[in-house]
């Protein structure tokens, strides 16, 4: 969380951003809130990016003002116009690119004053893993697959029964480049699996951490997976 203040005494307003991560090819949100103002026509929101000449986005007098927008963001940005009046200056970024990573500034002007806060935006690819029993294998084998990751993640297996055990000797992980030549498909196979146990396949890079669990018993198979972004710090 980054909290920024305006420059001069009573003419300062608090602006708050939250560091976040964007998933390449999908839409992302750059989060920014400010002390709300009841005079909508006086509110100005400017999004800027370090190293970029033009603006990322500008909203003023109740609507988008994109004449100064940098070419790299053309047609890809929007604020939540209906939420500006209650202090939401968050930016929706369409079709996130690897090059969108960097330091952004959310700069706000209202009838009460000015304020700004920076935001670190990371980009990469992350996806939920799915763990299945590989019935084609000669021994009891689990197969963990996740379709899109970047940068290349680490994969670690864990088990509820053998807590702390190192499965690197009995697992094999491969990374297959996807068609757009950036993201990769992650496939990890775990051998010598025992029944009545819960196994976890943990995939992690500097942006996200995802876990796929599978519980195998004689009568049923239960799966669960979740994904967590690692760098959601507020400013």
């Amino acid at each position: 969380l980054i909290i920024g203040f305006g420059i001069s005494g009573r003419h300062s307003i608090t602006v708050t951003t939250v560091a976040s991560a964007g998933n390449i090819g999908e839409d992302g949100i750059l989060s920014c809130t400010f002390e709300p103002d009841i005079k909508l026509s006086d509110i100005v929101i400017q999004w800027l990016k370090e190293g970029v000449l033009g603006l990322v986005h500008e909203f003023k007098e109740g609507k988008d003002e994109l004449s100064e927008q940098d070419e790299m963001f053309r047609g890809r940005t929007a604020v939540f116009a209906d939420q500006v009046i209650v202090g939401n200056a968050s930016l929706r970024l369409k079709n996130v690119q690897l090059t969108d990573a960097g330091t952004y500034k959310c700069y706000i002007i209202t009838s009460k004053g000015k304020g700004n806060a920076n935001l670190e935006y990371k980009t990469g690819a992350f996806s939920m893993p799915e763990v299945n029993v590989d019935y084609n294998a000669s021994s009891e084998t689990l197969r963990c697959e996740a379709p899109r990751w970047f940068p290349q993640p680490t994969v670690v297996w864990a088990s509820q029964v053998d807590q702390g055990a190192n499965f690197s000797e009995v697992s094999n992980t491969s990374f297959e480049l996807n068609s757009e030549n950036v993201t990769m498909k992650v496939v990890s196979v775990l051998y010598n699996v025992t029944i009545n146990n819960t196994y976890s396949c943990m995939i992690e890079n500097d942006i996200a951490k995802a876990t796929g669990d599978i519980k195998v018993t004689e009568s049923e198979i239960k799966r669960r997976s979740h994904l967590q972004l690692l760098n959601s710090k507020a400013s």
Epitope: I38, D42, I85, V86
Partner: antibody
Framework: EVQLVQSGAEVKKPGASVKVSCKVS????????MHWVRQAPGQGLEWIGA????????EYAPKFQGRVTLTADTSTSTAYMELSSLRSEDTAVYYC??????????WGQGTTVTVSS | DIQMTQSPSSLSASVGDRVTITCQAT??????LNWYQQKPGKPPKFLIY???QLAEGVPSRFSGSGSGTDYTLTISSLQPEDFATYYC?????????FGGGTKVEIK
């Protein structure tokens, strides 16, 4: 659940003052503007003013400037509207209304103020 | 101040009718307009925000549209519980101003 609970009906004499309260629960009171709107019998809605409790910033409709005072007690999440120099045309239902998710999204139940000699 | 002219001031309609209420602003309010429904003895109820977005729990027979200075609230098929007074509110320019209201009565 968001709730705005207002104080009870008041009967006042011309020239007196009235203070209406509005107790808020269900959202962060200090971080959003609270407005006051009134409605005279059989009439439309009229904006009086607003307060930002976190900083005690206030904005008033020009018509009410100098006669209305908006305050807030952040410890009890309660907003107050005091109207002075009452006259018969101030007889109305007074509402508090929040701007939390949107402009005037939640409303108090209303407080009837009757000004009569 | 921006003036909001609401029309008609009242109308009579039957259950199942399509009802249209309009609000005209004295200047462009850039879609910064909400609609409210009020029944006798009750506070206004938040209906539509930012011209066309339905508030939570509001039936889909209600819809809003418009831009610039002209805005419309439509009830596609009037239900018994819809007989009430409707108000528009502009919040683009300070101070916020309401339309005069439209009373929807049973024919």
């Amino acid at each position: 659940e968001v709730q705005l609970v207002q104080s009870g009906a008041e009967v006042k004499k011309p020239g007196a003052s009235v203070k209406v309260s509005c107790k808020v629960s269900g959202y962060p009171f200090t971080s959003y503007w609270m407005h006051w709107v009134r409605q005279a019998p059989g009439q439309g809605l009229e904006w009086i003013g607003a307060i930002y409790p976190g900083k005690s910033d206030t904005e008033y409709a020009p018509k009410f400037q100098g006669r209305v005072t908006l305050t807030a007690d952040t410890s009890t999440s309660t907003a107050y509207m005091e109207l002075s120099s009452l006259r018969s045309e101030d007889t109305a239902v007074y509402y508090c209304t929040s701007t939390w998710t949107h402009y005037f999204d939640y409303w108090g139940q209303g407080t009837t103020v009757t000004v009569s000699s | 101040d921006i003036q909001m002219t609401q029309s008609p001031s009242s109308l009579s309609a039957s259950v199942g009718d399509r009802v249209t209420i309009t609000c005209q602003a004295t200047q462009d309010i850039v879609k910064s307009l909400n609609w409210y429904q009020q029944k006798p003895g009750k506070p206004p109820k938040f209906l539509i925000y930012y011209t066309a977005q339905l508030a939570e729990g509001v039936p889909s027979r209600f819809s809003g549209s418009g831009s610039g200075t002209d805005y419309t609230l439509t009830i596609s098929s009037l239900q018994p519980e819809d007989f009430a007074t409707y108000y528009c509110l502009q919040f683009y320019e300070f101070p916020p101003t309401f339309g005069g209201g439209t009373k929807v009565e049973i024919k």
